[in-house]
Interface confidence: low
């Protein structure tokens, strides 16, 4: 409602159109529709968006016009349900259209597919892209939004507008350059990699909200914002957490117009209150809106205030601990988390949340005891092993990464995770292990004080990918257990898994290990994926194979590919040498 609180907006769609402007309105509606109907052709979505936009304009002109008072879910849902091919394209998703709001929107959300059956995006020649960009810039950029949104149905919509702005800037600059490819391709690679990372980070936020509830998300936000803004008062952090929770709840719920609007509001508030939030925001706040919001989200941690008192005084030594806890449990725990996090930028958010959970469990037990103070006096001692576990794990894995390099480190993780959860599909194991392996180059270069927040919070994002992909087609009780029991203990849960002794090895299939000359034309990355796919399959056939056995087979395989790619008759080489390799591998592994 407005400041004057006369009444709610007569027309929500007109309100959002006026707030966001036509360009952002159309882009956000396109993203919303593409995230819901992931298989629909681009042209169909553009038509739907244009119809919604024209309708919104009539409501701006006259808010009392017919249907202008309907909710955005009703308007958008009605529009999606006009798609003629809904039943044949989406099957049971069409049943959503028989429901009323809000159940209909919930139904659409449940049918979002994290792994849609869509062709891989192939990048055309630079000249082809530049011609398309110059011929119709608007369509070119809409196509970008559409292709990303349908493949990443939880992509943070206002951030996708920022990516599109950078995408446009790259083409505007590089299509005029002397060497278009040298200018454009690195920029597109950077956008692709950043986009994948952004999508995965947002997917964790949505999973946190949807699977573990608002309280879990708010706890995460208190910890992260307290690390980032350690000079801010608890009340200020609480306000930011409330606003941030609203923004992400809206985006994860498909309310993209409200989400973008509220995110702009939040960025504005933060910039107007920099003095009471952080000294690091100045540069961010001088940027235009999309850049500003992105910059704030990535801003470095402010310096910790000097002379912060010991935590023990308020949270252990005070005789009022149980009284304060009983009066307002979540506020007291929030203050504990805030005070601990602002003192520990060197801890991961998930570690801070584990400590807060341990503290909460201790108070629940001790505040009901005969002598509460005596009972909780040693609570901080319980934190030591919780802190040491990720520290040791990161130390060991960084040493292994430095010894092996990224590709071989990924292979070590592939073997490790395939042995833990061999039922998981090979493409998922390859994707997840490759991403887990990237933690080395991403985080091991950092000094000790930055390693844990970098590594463990990144691993949370990657393991969430495993969880959402596995949820679509569950095959392993162990994965389900680690994914659903505790959000903050997912990584320790997976780390603790040993080889699955109940697994019945996969039948040997020579076809899986048959390769052709097309492997020679692949990029280095795609060739690695082929080899890593073969490695996972080997482990599934022979889960008890030793590291040495697997290394020998993989070395033979690499030599075989190199030899045949240099041969004159590549296809014959792959056929003949391939048979020899399979026989040798079977012998080496005792298959």
């Amino acid at each position: 409602r407005g400041v004057f609180r006369r009444d709610a907006h007569k027309s929500e769609v007109a309100h959002r159109f006026k707030d966001l402007g036509e360009e952002n309105f159309k882009a956000l509606v396109l993203i919303a529709f593409a995230q819901y109907l992931q298989q629909c052709p681009f042209e169909d979505h553009v038509k739907l968006v244009n119809e919604v936009t024209e309708f919104a304009k009539t409501c701006v002109a006259d808010e009392s016009a017919e249907n202008c008072d309907k909710s955005l879910h009703t308007l958008f849902g009605d529009k999606l349900c006009t798609v003629a091919t809904l039943r044949e394209t989406y099957g049971e998703m069409a049943d959503c259209c028989a429901k009323q709001e809000p159940e209909r929107n919930e139904c659409f959300l449940q049918h979002k597919d994290d792994n849609p059956n869509l062709p891989r995006l192939v990048r055309p020649e630079v000249d082809v892209m530049c011609t398309a960009f110059h011929d119709n810039e608007e369509t070119f950029l809409k196509k970008y939004l559409y292709e990303i949104a349908r493949r990443h149905p939880y992509f943070y919509a206002p951030e996708l507008l920022f990516f599109a702005k950078r995408y446009k800037a790259a083409f505007t600059e590089c299509c005029q350059a002397a060497d278009k490819a040298a200018c454009l391709l690195p920029k597109l690679d950077e956008l692709r990699d950043e986009g994948k990372a952004s999508s995965a980070k947002q997917r964790l936020k949505c999973a946190s909200l949807q699977k573990f509830g608002e309280r879990a998300f708010k706890a995460w936000a208190v910890a992260r914002l307290s690390q980032r803004f350690p000079k801010a008062e608890f009340a200020e952090v609480s306000k930011l957490v409330t606003d941030l929770t609203k923004v992400h709840t809206e985006c994860c719920h498909g309310d993209l117009l409200e989400c973008a609007d509220d995110r702009a509001d939040l960025a504005k508030y933060i910039c107007e209150n920099q003095d009471s939030i952080s000294s690091k925001l100045k540069e961010c706040c001088e940027k235009p809106l999309l850049e500003k919001s992105h910059c704030i989200a990535e801003v470095e941690n402010d310096e910790m205030p000097a002379d912060l008192p010991s935590l023990a005084a308020d949270f252990v030594e005070s005789k009022d601990v149980c009284k304060n806890y009983a009066e307002a449990k979540d506020v007291f725990l929030g203050m504990f988390l805030y005070e601990y996090a602002r003192r520990h930028p060197d801890y991961s958010v998930v570690l801070l949340l584990r400590l807060a959970k341990t503290y909460e469990t201790t108070l629940e037990k001790c505040c009901a005891a005969a002598d509460p103070h005596e009972c909780y006096a040693k609570v901080f001692d319980e934190f030591k092993p919780l802190v040491e576990e990720p520290q040791n794990l990161i130390k060991q894995n960084c040493e292994l990464f430095e010894q092996l390099g990224e590709y071989k480190f990924q292979n070590a993780l592939l073997v490790r995770y395939t042995k833990k959860v061999p039922q998981v599909s090979t493409p998922t194991l390859v994707e997840v292990s490759r991403n887990l392996g990237k933690v080395g180059s991403k985080c091991c270069k950092h000094p000790e004080a930055k390693r844990m927040p970098c590594a463990e919070d990144y691993l949370s994002v990657v393991l969430n990918q495993l969880c959402v992909l596995h949820e679509k087609t569950p095959v392993s009780d162990r994965v389900t257990k680690c994914c659903t029991e505790s959000l903050v203990n997912r990584r320790p849960c997976f780390s603790a898994l040993e080889v699955d002794e109940t697994y019945v090895p996969k039948e040997f299939n020579a076809e899986t290990f048959t390769f052709h000359a097309d492997i020679c034309t692949l990029s280095e990355k795609e060739r690695q994926i082929k080899k890593q796919t073969a490695l996972v399959e080997l482990v599934k056939h022979k889960p008890k194979a030793t590291k040495e056995q697997l290394k020998a087979v993989m070395d033979d395989f690499a030599a075989f590919v190199e030899k045949c790619c240099k041969a004159d008759d590549k296809e014959t080489c792959f056929a003949e040498e391939g048979k020899k390799l399979v026989a040798a591998s079977q012998a080496a592994l005792g298959l």
Epitope: R1, G2, V3, F4, R5, R6, D7, H9, K10, H15, K18, D19, L20, D261, A264, D265, K268
Partner: nanobody, 115 residues
Framework: EVQLVESGGGLVQPGGSLRLSCAAS????????MAWYRQAPGKQREFVSR???????NYPDSVKGRFTISRDNSKNTLYLQMNSLRAEDTAVYYC?????????WGQGTLVTVSS
């Protein structure tokens, strides 16, 4: 569109008080936030105070404790009570409003603090 008209400016001595008013008309139901800004001669426009849709207010340190923003819903009017005025508060004061950011502006009212 939203129309905003400020009033209440004038000459006041250091340490004195003034109350500025801003009357809003037009599509005011779309307004989520209202604010006061000021611009001294030869200087950039500066944020003075804001009241959001929820009634929360904020001020920069330069006016905190001296200025108070408030509103009267029944009259669609925004106020700025200015106490302990200083010479450096001399400026044209603008009322601003909008759904997300302050996109509608008044013409301004001049406040001069001088002995």
């Amino acid at each position: 569109e939203v129309q905003l008209v400020e009033s209440g400016g004038g000459l006041v001595q250091p340490g004195g008080s003034l109350r500025l008013s801003c009357a809003a008309s037009g599509s005011i139901e779309s307004i989520n936030r209202m604010a006061w800004y000021r611009q001294a001669p030869g200087k950039q426009r500066e944020f003075v105070s804001r009241i959001s849709k929820g009634g929360s207010t904020n001020y920069p340190d330069s006016v905190k404790g001296r200025f108070t923003i408030s509103r009267d819903n029944s009259k669609n009017t925004l106020y700025l009570q200015m106490n302990s005025l200083r010479a450096e508060d001399t400026a044209v004061y603008y009322c601003a409003a909008g759904p997300v950011w302050e996109q509608f502006w008044g013409q301004g009212t001049l406040v001069t603090v001088s002995s």
